[in-house]
Interface confidence: low
């Protein structure tokens, strides 16, 4: 069966539809599309010939039709005029007509709906405000939407009957309730924007902030109202009464006491025309001066005065509390506080009392600590101290007495020597003292504040001490053998012990060794080279003992029979002749060497290089000592051989005694002194 | 006759050092406290350092502790005054001076002075 | 510190007057102080110690009074040498402290 279908079949306004013709027979003529549900001439849109590909408008084309060969009706920007019914007619080939009729609706694009009210100021709780949902449209739906959620049931809403008006009753304070409307046909949907209502409320009664009393003189006063209300409160604020200012925040800089009062803020609402009140007490206070402590007596004297301490300044509303030594003061026989707690009396005040006393002021706004007064207690002066007390001192020292006596204030001394001043000093210093300075030594302590003196007196001995000895010799070079050598502990003192040491050791007595003078000569009988020493005295009393520097004797000695190396006797030809001599002796000897009874050179060593049979000869070291005045020799006879020979060994001695080479050296004693002492 | 004879004064740099001397003569130096007084050139007269007799015990004025050290050679007959981090504040004639009774006593003997000057 | 008040700061006078000067301490310092004088060029000489004794070789026309905190010192029948500057020290332990001085000059 033929049938049309419309697409859509709701048309927006200005959109297109589409009719389209089902169930269409297969041998087609052509087909004709009417205006309305029948055939009607007049009401023609237009025709199809299929097979002459022909379309042919009617009286009923707008030009906004578009006739298509598959049977189908397009009609573009429709107006609502274009709703209603139309109808095609298929022409078959064998002409037999079939008819179907179709049909859409127009409807207008609504426009995005908008919500006035009655009331756009409700005073809360008691206004309700109608909202109508703008504008008014045929054939559409109304809706409400709040806080995005579709209407609730709720006593406070209430609609009308076509939906288009909101009714909303006991509207509170703060409503941020959002409110929207929704229109709809059946071509579309459109909200509103959405509507809050300003709800009118106030002023509640205001709140002053900060409440932070009492001030400080000298601070800023800066006080806050604010009253819930809407519209905004406008403020007043009146001091005691007074109108100051029409200020949110009252403020005032740099105050004082008299800035103390009722302050009074007064919140009013314009809209509602309602005014309320709120008073604060504001009371300001001077901030406290550091206080400081006055005293009766600055000086008192110990176990005696008593001392007045006075907390300073006095001022009003204000605590006095005393600290002692940094603790809350506590009962105590020695301490007294007045009525008010301003004056602290202190007794019996011992020397050397180092408690602090500080007093302390409080009031609201502040709390001040004086700084510390401690008390200077007069005392003294004790009886003195004199000290080192070393005596007895040895003459020749430093005495340096210091004398101390406890005293506040400190001491002035003066120092007596056997009842005679000497000086105003604290320490008394007598350089280099001898047995004149013993006596009676007095200090005297005075303290000027107190008016008192105290004396001590220490008997100081100074007794002499025995000097260090010294050993004087009569022979600090003595011969050895022939010399005796007298050694005397210097210098002579009475009452004294003489002792002696020998190579550290005490004396042992010898028969070479004698003592006399009451042990303070030692005499040494015929020196050895052995008695060098060192020796040392000794002298001692009931006081001291003292000890010689060590003293040595340069015993002079030899020379003795001179040794010649090495021992041998023959050398061959060309070789070199090296010889030493060497002679015990002090001091040194002096060495020459004699070949064949002619002088040869003044030197311990002789030394001849390539000998020949020319070298063959009689050689003689000689040895002299000018202190003891003795000589010495010793005579090698030297073969030089041109072949080898077994070395031999011998020496002729010969010493200062006498001995056949003794005239040799006669011969050469001028001309040996000569050389020696150039 | 006393005698108390400074030395050592000069002009040096802020921040800078000098060592004053003083010798004595005349008494027995070794008995007697010993102080450094100074006189600025608004002809101020200041204490600054104390020494005993043996030199056992030290003080210093507020303004220049940590900075001078006074010491003293007894063998010497001599006070000495080591002064550092030098301010030109401390611009002075620096004296020598023996006291009566230490402590509780007052200048008995004065040197001739000499002259510190600290300038940049 | 103990403050020596000295005044006056400087004083005129003819050869034969008599002058005082004097000198207040900030706190009670008993008779442990000292008068100074000291001329053109040359450093301080002790005067007067302990408020009233005379210091070795100073002529008798000075003289020292006072205790506690007020101190004078007088000069009788002034000779030529006596003119300079003249200092109060305490000597109440340390730190000593000066006054700030008194010229007497000639008149």
């Known amino acids: 069966q033929l049938t049309i279908e419309s697409r859509p079949f709701n048309v927006a306004e200005g959109k297109e539809v589409l009719l389209l013709a089902h169930n269409v027979s297969q041998n087609l003529f052509g087909y004709i599309w009417y205006k309305g549900e029948r055939v009607d001439a007049s009401r023609r849109i237009g025709s199809c010939v299929i097979r002459t590909q022909q379309i042919t408008p009617g009286p009923a084309h707008s030009g906004r039709e578009t006739i298509d060969f598959n049977a189908s009706l397009l009609i573009q920007n429709v107006t609502q005029s274009d709703t209603g019914s139309y109808t095609i007619q298929v022409i078959k080939e064998d002409l037999v007509n079939e008819e179907a009729t179709g049909q859409f609706r127009v409807y207008p694009e609504l426009p995005k709906p908008y919500i006035t009210s009655n009331n756009s100021n409700p005073i809360e709780d008691k206004d309700a405000v109608a909202l109508t949902c703008e504008p008014e449209t045929q054939d559409t739906t109304y809706l409400w939407w709040v806080n995005n959620q579709s209407l609730p049931v709720s006593p406070r809403l209430e609609l009308s009957s076509d939906n288009r008006t909101l009714t909303v009753f006991n509207i509170p304070r703060n409503d941020t309730t959002s409110y929207k409307c929704e229109t709809q046909n059946p071509v579309s949907v459109r909200r509103s924007d959405p509507v809050t209502l300003n709800v009118l409320y106030g002023p509640d009664a205001p709140t002053i902030s900060p409440l932070n009393t009492p001030y400080r003189a000298g601070e800023y006063l800066n006080l806050t109202c604010h009253a819930a209300s809407n519209p905004t409160a406008q403020y007043f604020w009146f001091v005691n009464g007074t109108f100051q200012q029409s200020t949110q925040e009252l403020f005032i800089p740099n105050i004082t006491v008299n800035n103390s009062g009722s302050y009074m803020c007064q919140a009013h609402n314009s809209a509602t025309g309602l005014n309320r009140t709120t008073v604060t007490a504001i009371t300001v206070y001077a901030e406290l001066p550091k206080p400081y402590i006055t005293s009766n007596n600055s000086n008192p004297i110990e176990d005696k005065d008593a001392v007045t301490l006075t907390c300073e300044p006095e001022t009003q509303d204000t605590t006095y509390l005393w600290w002692v030594n940094n603790q809350r003061l506590s009962v105590s026989s020695r301490l007294e506080l007045s009525n008010d707690n301003r004056t602290l009396t202190v007794f019996n005040i011992p020397r050397n009392d180092t408690t602090f006393y500080e007093c302390e002021t409080q009031n609201p706004v502040s709390v001040r600590r004086s700084d510390p007064v401690t008390l200077n207690v007069l005392y003294g002066p004790d009886a003195p101290t004199i000290s080192p007390l070393n005596t007895p001192y040895r003459a020749g020292e430093n005495l340096n007495l210091s004398c101390h006596a406890a005293s506040n204030p400190a001491a002035q001394y003066f120092w007596f020597v056997n009842g005679t001043f000497q000086q105003s000093t604290q320490e008394l210093f007598i350089p280099n003292i001898t047995v004149n300075n013993s006596g009676s030594y007095m200090c005297q302590a005075h303290n000027s504040a107190t008016g008192l003196n105290r004396t001590t007196v220490t008997a100081i001995t100074v007794y002499v001490e025995l000097p260090k000895p010294y050993i004087s010799s009569n022979n600090s070079n003595p011969i050895e053998d022939k010399d005796a050598v007298t050694l005397t502990c210097e210098p002579v003192a009475e009452n004294t012990t003489y002792l002696w040491w020998v190579n550290n050791q005490s004396l042992s007595v010898s028969p070479r060794l004698q003592l006399s003078n009451g042990n303070r000569i030692l005499t040494l009988l015929s020196v050895t080279r052995n008695d060098t020493g060192p020796y040392e005295c000794g002298i001692q009393n009931s006081e001291s003992a003292k000890r010689s520097d060590p003293v040595t004797l340069n015993v002079t000695y030899g020379p003795d029979t001179p040794i010649i190396s090495p021992p041998d006797l023959s050398y061959r030809s060309g070789a070199n002749l090296n010889l030493s001599c060497h002679s015990d002796s002090n001091p040194s000897p002096q060495y020459s060497w004699l070949i064949n009874g002619t002088l040869r050179q003044h030197t311990q060593v002789l030394f001849i290089s390539k000998i020949t049979s020319n070298n063959n000869g009689a050689y003689a070291c000689f040895v002299s000592n000018l202190a003891t005045g003795r000589n010495n020799s010793i005579v090698k006879n030297i073969s030089v051989s041109s072949g080898d020979s077994a070395p031999g060994s011998s020496g002729l001695s010969a010493s200062g005694s006498g001995s056949g080479l003794n005239d040799i050296f006669e011969a050469q004693k001028i001309e040996w002194h000569h050389h020696h002492h150039h | 006759e006393v005698q108390l004879v400074e030395s050592g004064g000069g002009l040096v740099k802020p921040g800078g050092s000098l060592k004053l001397s003083c010798a004595a003569s005349?008494?027995?130096?070794?008995?007697?406290?010993m102080s450094w007084v100074r006189q600025t050139p608004e002809k101020r007269l200041e204490w600054v350092a104390f020494?005993?007799?043996?030199?056992?015990?030290?003080y210093y004025a507020d303004t220049v502790k940590g900075r001078f050290t006074i010491s003293r050679d007894n063998a010497k007959n001599t006070l000495y005054l080591q002064m550092s981090s030098l301010k030109s504040e401390d611009t002075a004639m620096f004296y020598c001076?023996?006291?009566?009774?230490?402590?509780?006593?007052?200048?008995?003997?004065w040197g001739q002075g000499t002259l510190v000057t600290v300038s940049a | 510190d103990i403050q020596m008040t000295q005044s006056p700061a400087s004083l005129s006078a003819s050869v034969g007057e008599t002058v005082t000067i004097t000198c207040r301490a900030s706190?009670?310092?008993?008779?442990?102080f000292a008068w100074y004088q000291q001329k053109q060029g040359k450093s301080p000489q002790l005067l007067v110690y302990?408020?009233?004794i005379l210091a070795e070789g100073v002529p008798s026309r000075f003289s020292g009074s006072g205790s506690g905190t007020q101190f004078s010192l007088k000069i009788n029948s002034l000779q030529p040498e006596d003119f300079g500057t003249y200092y109060c020290?305490?000597?109440?332990?340390?730190?000593?402290?000066f006054g700030s001085g008194t010229k007497l000059e000639l008149k």
């Open positions: 001076a023996a006291h009566y009774f230490g402590t509780s006593g007052p200048f008995a003997y």
């Open positions: 302990n408020a009233k």
């Open positions: 005349g008494f027995t130096f070794s008995s007697y406290d």
């Open positions: 020290q305490h000597h109440y332990g340390i730190p000593f402290t």
């Open positions: 706190e009670n310092i008993y008779s442990y």
């Open positions: 020494i005993s007799s043996y030199g056992g015990r030290t």
